[in-house]
């Protein structure tokens, strides 16, 4: 049952004399393993013998032996799947049909394969895409229906006979479906490749030429143009004529339209290959090109730069940067349309020529206020001198200059005055917008650069102001030099260092902390009485009568200041002692008599002693001696002694007379 045999292999295999052929082949014999295989060349079925006749190229026997003459042909298969064959070398007369006679235990099959062997190596075949456009990548394919393991070959690409630089990718196929060798080349053709010959060359392993295929490239491209100009340097003066010609060096397909462009914009009514410009003006300076189109698109020539030369136009000045800050750098640029470019420049500041400045740019490394003003320039080239344009204004900004704090008051300023100060400045750009004052925050803040100090203090010494725009400039501080009466006047005892005793030498000093002006006069007074006009008040020998309340006054041209009253205390021993008697120095017996020891002492008497007419001290120590009832025997002279921390003093004798009462006399 023939339906049991299934074969897969290429239908036809190609080779050439001396090469080899490799026949990939698979089969299935479903009833069992292959027992016999014969490879016939052009087999013919003999009906009489019911067998195939023909040249036997290969025969396998049951015992597996292969005759030695069959070495050229090899069966590389097996008993159930593989039926691959190799013929090496292959000859021209091997062309025709190969018959694979297969036999299993119960079945037989003849499988036919076509073999085409040429006398010489056949050429490969180049495949091109349907259309090739310039600069678009295409893949060129070179295909050869041949591949054999025993006969290595290579495919090489040539352009106009020269090997191509691009790397080709070669692949081979030896499968039951197909047998081939293929080379693929990726390539971006340029318009210049149009009409060029591309060759795919078949070579053996040693690089020996075997065969080739060639094609002519048909590269579609936009028109390629050349522009010619008269005069050739394209430099003319106003009023001259210019001719430009456009030549098409290549176009595929043929061109359809022509136009001219200036600075990228199409020129109206210029549709021929020649452009004539008569009596040119400077406005016609620019970049010219011609444009020719075909079905691929427009092609443009290189640009011709037409220069119409003219004298410089009125110039303008560009300043980098205005306003400028004093001390910064500034650059001025003179801009003037001219052809050729100006070779010389003349610069003006406020209408006056700036000496030594002949360049297009003027650089001032350190701007000062006097640099402000109008800058203009004049440009000059070989055709003439331009006009001076309107110029540009340089604004130089700087902090306020020469700031001074000015005292508006008539001098001198006295403590308590209202002082007015103004903050003045010489110049400022931009304008002064505010003022600041030192000391900070001491007074009501002024507004328009005038500071009013109400009731100025003696201690307000120095003031400074600043005028501010974008920056603050401080004036040097000014001294108010406030004049005031002497301050902190007080009496100070210089000597003695300890307490004052009667008879001491005493010096009092009139002190004050400060005075402005410094020239002062002193006055000492006691109880409204003037004592002296020196800073010191001296007592050679102080007496208790000098004690009391002293004040000193210090005055200057502004006023006078008094000290607090200062009490001078003189210490002395008890003096002026006397004994006084109450009710009198004659007292009737039985009545009461009081003797008092009166004295003048500083400090007061602390201790009293009483004596009788016999200078006998009495046992009484208080200021008063009370006799009650008084007796006639108490009559006599008494005296007292007073003691304080300084010393003692005694009184003179005072006589007490005690007389008899009427009762006593009556009894007598």
């Amino acid at each position: 049952d023939s339906s049991k045999w299934v074969f897969e292999h290429p239908e036809t295999l190609y080779a050439w004399e001396g090469a080899c052929v490799w026949i990939p082949c698979t089969y299935r014999a479903l009833d069992g393993d292959l027992e016999s295989f014969i490879l016939f060349h052009n087999p013919e079925y003999n009906k009489n013998t019911s067998k195939f006749d023909g040249t036997r190229l290969y025969e396998s026997t049951k015992d597996g032996k292969v005759p030695s003459e069959q070495k050229r042909v090899q069966f590389l298969g097996d008993k159930n799947k593989n039926c691959t064959l190799s013929i090496h070398p292959v000859h021209l007369n091997d062309s025709g049909q190969l018959g694979l006679r297969m036999e299993s235990k119960t079945e037989k099959w003849m499988e036919r394969i076509h073999l085409n062997v040429s006398e010489r190596p056949f050429p490969p075949h180049i495949q091109l895409p349907p259309e090739i456009q310039e600069s678009q990548e295409v893949t060129l394919t070179c295909l050869l229906n041949f591949s054999c393991y025993g006969y290595p070959i290579q495919l090489q690409w040539l352009l106009e006979g020269v090997p191509m630089r691009q790397a080709a990718v070669t692949s081979t196929s030896l499968t039951i479906k197909s047998v081939f060798t293929r080379s693929e080349l990726k390539f971006s053709p340029q318009w210049s490749h149009h009409g060029k010959i591309v060759t795919c060359q078949l070579q053996d392993a040693d690089g020996k030429f075997l065969s080739n295929d060639t094609v002519q490239l048909n590269v579609k491209h936009t028109p390629k143009l050349e522009i010619k100009v008269t005069p050739s340097d394209a430099i003319v003066r106003e009023g001259d004529s210019v001719t430009m010609t456009c030549e098409v060096s290549s176009s595929n397909p043929e061109y359809t339209t022509v136009s001219w462009l200036k600075d990228g914009t199409s020129l109206k009514k210029q549709n021929t290959f020649t452009l004539n410009l008569r009596e040119v003006t400077k406005d016609q300076s620019g970049k010219y090109c011609c444009q020719v189109s075909n079905d691929v698109g427009p092609g443009r020539s290189e640009e011709v730069f037409l220069q119409v030369q003219y004298a410089p136009e009125p110039s303008t000045v560009q300043i980098l940067h205005s306003p400028a800050v004093e001390g910064s750098q500034v650059e001025f640029l003179c801009m003037s349309l001219a052809n050729p470019l100006p070779t010389n420049y003349t610069w003006y500041h406020n209408g006056k020529e700036m000496q030594g400045r002949t360049e297009e740019k003027v650089h001032i490394p350190k701007i000062l206020p006097w640099h402000a003003g109008t800058y203009s320039c004049v440009a000059e080239n070989i055709l003439g001198t331009g006009q001076r344009g309107p110029g540009a204004e340089l604004d130089v900004q700087y902090p306020p200059k020469k700031v001074t704090t000015v005292i508006q008051n008539p001098m001198p300023i006295r403590e308590g005055d209202t002082v007015t100060l103004s903050c003045n400045y010489n110049s400022s750009n931009p304008s002064v917008t505010r003022y600041e004052w030192k000391p900070h925050g001491a007074w009501e803040e002024p507004s328009l650069g005038v500071l009013k100090i109400q009731n100025v203090g003696w201690d307000n010494t120095t003031i400074a102001c600043a005028a501010c725009n974008s920056w603050c400039s401080w004036a040097s501080p000014v001294a108010l030099n406030v004049q005031y009466a002497p301050r902190d006047v007080r009496v100070r005892k210089i000597k003695p260092l300890s307490e004052i005793h009667s008879g001491n030498s005493v010096s009092l000093q009139c002190d004050f902390s400060s005075s402005h002006p410094k020239e002062v006069q002193f006055f000492w007074e006691k109880n409204g009485r003037l004592l002296g006009k020196e800073s010191q008040l001296n007592f050679d020998s102080i007496s208790p009568e000098d004690a009391g309340s002293y004040s000193c006054w210090v005055n200057n041209s502004i006023g006078q200041t008094a000290s607090k009253a200062w009490t001078l205390e003189v210490l002395y021993a008890p003096r002026r002692l006397r004994v006084s008697m109450s009710p009198g120095d004659q007292v009737m017996e039985g009545k009461s008599a009081t003797l008092t020891c009166e004295s003048d002492a500083n400090p007061p008497v602390s201790h009293y002693t009483w004596f009788d007419w016999n200078n006998q001290s009495l046992p009484y120590h208080s200021q008063k001696l009370r006799l009650e009832p008084v007796k006639v025997q108490h009559s006599g002279a008494y005296w007292c002694q007073g003691t304080n921390s300084v010393g003692k003093g005694r009184s003179p004798l005072s006589t007490l007379t005690v007389y008899y009462s009427p009762e006593t006399i009556g009894r007598r």
Epitope: H440, G441, E445, T461
Partner: antibody
């Protein structure tokens, strides 16, 4: 008599802002600078800046320029200090005080910055 | 900016003693210096301004002196209520700056 009144304390979270107030009375508010002073334990007094209510002019200690913003409301005779992007180091006692020599002081506001 | 350097940082003294605190400015402040006293938990209080003028109500035992860059505060016959912290501050220009302070303690 001259008085500057400040709230006793403010508690705020880190990263937030706070506006401290200082209410003035007993004098012409627009005629004297209002100063703000910071006191941190063991760190002494630090001047933050001042504002002149009559014009709104301000001066700042460079250290506090991006931290404090001083404003006034003359109608209510109140000065304000806004502190932004608060962090723990902004926790302190903040005083307002009058004039260049600080003749009258508020009682101070204790600001605590804590999460 | 003008820096103020105050010394000493701390000082121990007894009632009745005389003490002096000094302040040095990094530039001439033209006598525009103030002295403050601060007690624990209280606002600072102005004692002296313009270097030597006593503020209203300040006892005469306090006195200020100095000029240019060197200034001092003297307290004669210390009283119990004088103990606390003292600060100097200039107001010649902005920024106003304070001294670091002097802590006056009872010995």
């Amino acid at each position: 008599q001259v008085q500057l009144q400040q709230p006793g304390a403010e508690l705020v979270k880190p990263g937030t802002s706070v506006k401290l107030s200082c209410k003035a009375s007993g004098y012409n508010f627009t005629s004297y600078w209002i100063n703000w002073v910071k006191l941190r334990p063991g760190q002494g007094l630090e001047w933050i800046g001042d504002i002149y209510p009559g014009s709104g002019n301000t001066n700042y200690n460079e250290k506090f320029k991006s931290k404090a913003t001083l404003t006034v409301d003359t109608s209510s005779t109140t000065a304000y200090m806004q502190l932004s992007s608060l962090a723990s180091e902004d926790s302190a006692l903040y005083y307002c005080a009058r004039r260049g020599y600080l003749d009258y002081w508020g009682q101070g506001t204790t600001l605590t910055v804590s999460s | 900016d003008i820096q103020m350097t105050q010394s000493p940082a701390s000082l121990s003294a007894s009632v009745g003693e005389t003490v002096t605190i000094t302040c040095r400015a990094s530039g001439n402040i033209h006598n525009y210096l103030a002295w403050y006293q601060q007690k624990q938990g209280k606002s600072p209080q102005l004692l002296v301004y313009n270097a030597k003028t006593l503020a209203d109500g300040v006892p005469s035992r306090f006195s200020g002196s100095g000029s240019g860059t060197q200034y001092s505060l003297t307290i004669n016959s210390l009283q119990p209520e004088d103990f606390g912290s003292y600060y100097c501050q200039h107001f010649w220009s902005t920024p106003l700056t304070f001294g670091a302070g002097t802590k006056l303690e009872l010995k």
